[in-house]
């Protein structure tokens, strides 16, 4: 979280930014809020990228004001408008590319004053794993599956009975890249698993982390995915 | 869920003051504006002005300055109204409503002016 | 001060039957316009804010459109629920201005 403080003569207004990551291909959000104005007519959002000449975005006098967008993000950003009379100043960024990350100013000017934050936006890929039994396969198998991972990520396996076991002699991991020559699939397999147990497959690059888990008993099979962002920080 | 009380209805003199009161739960008390608006009967809804709870600063409708004073104890997670030299056209129900989109009312507090 | 002009002050319709009511700012407003309904013996209640933008739990019913100085609220089907008075409010600039008020009844 990172908060910060504008002067304007008397008055300074708190920005908040928290940091955060898009998914490339996917939409994203880069989160911003501030002391709200009571009036729409006198604030200005202004999101800055560092290294980049022209804005970002641009919404003052209750529109977008796009005539000094950079060429990189012309048509991809949108303020939530409906917010910004309520101090949300967050940009929604569509189609999130690799070149995206960096480090964004959220610069804010009400009737009470000015005020500015930074954020660091990193962008990657990351998806859910889905585990499952390979049926294929000579001795019971598990099979973790996740479509888009980027920078490449690590992969461990976990058991719930077995607790810090070493898995990596008995597992084998493989990256496949996809056809738009960034992302890769993951898949990693898990030789001579029991049953009644709970494996976990967990995937990890300096981005996101996910878990797969599968419990496998005589009578049933049963899944859990979890994914978490691992850089939301407020400033 | 975000609940506004205000206080009772109120009978007063010309020339005296009222002071309304606003109390609020459910949410985070001081991150936005509390307005206050006023419905004479029959009448269309007057914004009179609004207060920003954590700051305490204000903005007044013009009409009201130098007779309204909006205030704020945040301790009680309450905000207050205060109308002075009340004559007879400032009876009306007064409203309290929570930050600058009006997202929240509270019930509406009955002010009779009346010698 | 900006000034926010209704039309029609009231109205009569059918259930079913769909309902427009319009509001005019003096001057631009941007999309700086909510529309709230009020029910008698009741605090208004917020439906549309930013102009189109309807509020959490709003009926989707209820819809709002337009920009600079003209903007309209409409009720697809009109409900017997929906007898009530219909503001519109800027919120663009101060003070904070609302429209003389729609009453709706039912036919």
């Known amino acids: 979280l990172i908060i910060g403080f504008g002067i304007s003569g008397r008055h300074s207004i708190t920005v908040t930014t928290v940091a955060s990551a898009g998914n490339i291909g996917e939409d994203g959000i880069l989160s911003c809020t501030f002391e709200p104005d009571i009036k729409l007519s006198d604030i200005v959002i202004q999101w800055l990228k560092e290294g980049v000449l022209g804005l970002v975005h641009e919404f003052k006098e209750g529109k977008d004001e796009l005539s000094e967008q950079d060429e990189m993000f012309r048509g991809r950003t949108a303020v939530f408008a409906d917010q910004v009379i309520v101090g949300n100043a967050s940009l929604r960024l569509k189609n999130v590319q690799l070149t995206d990350a960096g480090t964004y100013k959220c610069y804010i000017i009400t009737s009470k004053g000015k005020g500015n934050a930074n954020l660091e936006y990193k962008t990657g890929a990351f998806s859910m794993p889905e585990v499952n039994v390979d049926y294929n396969a000579s001795s019971e198998t598990l099979r973790c599956e996740a479509p888009r991972w980027f920078p490449q990520p690590t992969v461990v396996w976990a058991s719930q009975v077995d607790q810090g076991a070493n898995f990596s002699e008995v597992s084998n991991t493989s990256f496949e890249l996809n056809s738009e020559n960034v992302t890769m699939k993951v898949v990693s397999v898990l030789y001579n698993v029991t049953i009644n147990n709970t494996y976990s497959c967990m995937i990890e690059n300096d981005i996101a982390k996910a878990t797969g888990d599968i419990k496998v008993t005589e009578s049933e099979i049963k899944r859990r995915s979890h994914l978490q962002l691992l850089n939301s920080k407020a400033s | 869920e975000v609940q506004l009380v205000q206080s009772g209805a109120e009978v007063k003199k010309p020339g005296a003051s009222v002071k309304v009161s606003c109390k609020a739960s459910g949410d985070t008390f001081t991150t936005y504006w509390m307005n206050w608006v006023r419905q004479a009967p029959g009448q269309r809804l007057e914004w009179m002005g609004g207060i920003y709870l954590n700051r305490g600063s204000s903005e007044y409708n013009e009409k009201f300055k130098g007779r309204v004073t909006l205030t704020v104890d945040t301790s009680a997670s309450t905000a207050y109204m205060e109308l002075s030299s009340l004559r007879s056209e400032d009876t009306a129900v007064y409203y309290c409503a929570r930050d600058s989109r009006f997202s929240y009312w509270g019930q509406g507090t009955l002010v009779t002016v009346s010698s | 001060d900006i000034q926010m002009t209704q039309s029609p002050s009231s109205l009569s319709a059918s259930v079913g039957d769909r309902v427009t009511i319009t509001c005019k700012a003096s001057q631009d407003v941007s999309t700086a316009v909510a529309w709230y309904q009020q029910k008698p013996g009741k605090a208004p209640k917020l439906l549309i804010s930013?102009?189109?933008y309807r509020y959490t739990g709003v009926p989707s019913r209820f819809s709002g459109s337009g920009s600079g100085t003209d903007f309209t609220f409409t009720i697809s089907s009109l409900q017997p629920e929906d007898i009530a008075t219909y503001y519109c409010?800027?919120?663009?600039?101060?003070?904070?201005?609302f429209g003389g008020g729609t009453k709706v009844e039912i036919k």
């Open positions: 930013s102009a189109s």
């Open positions: 409010q800027q919120h663009y600039n101060t003070p904070l201005t």
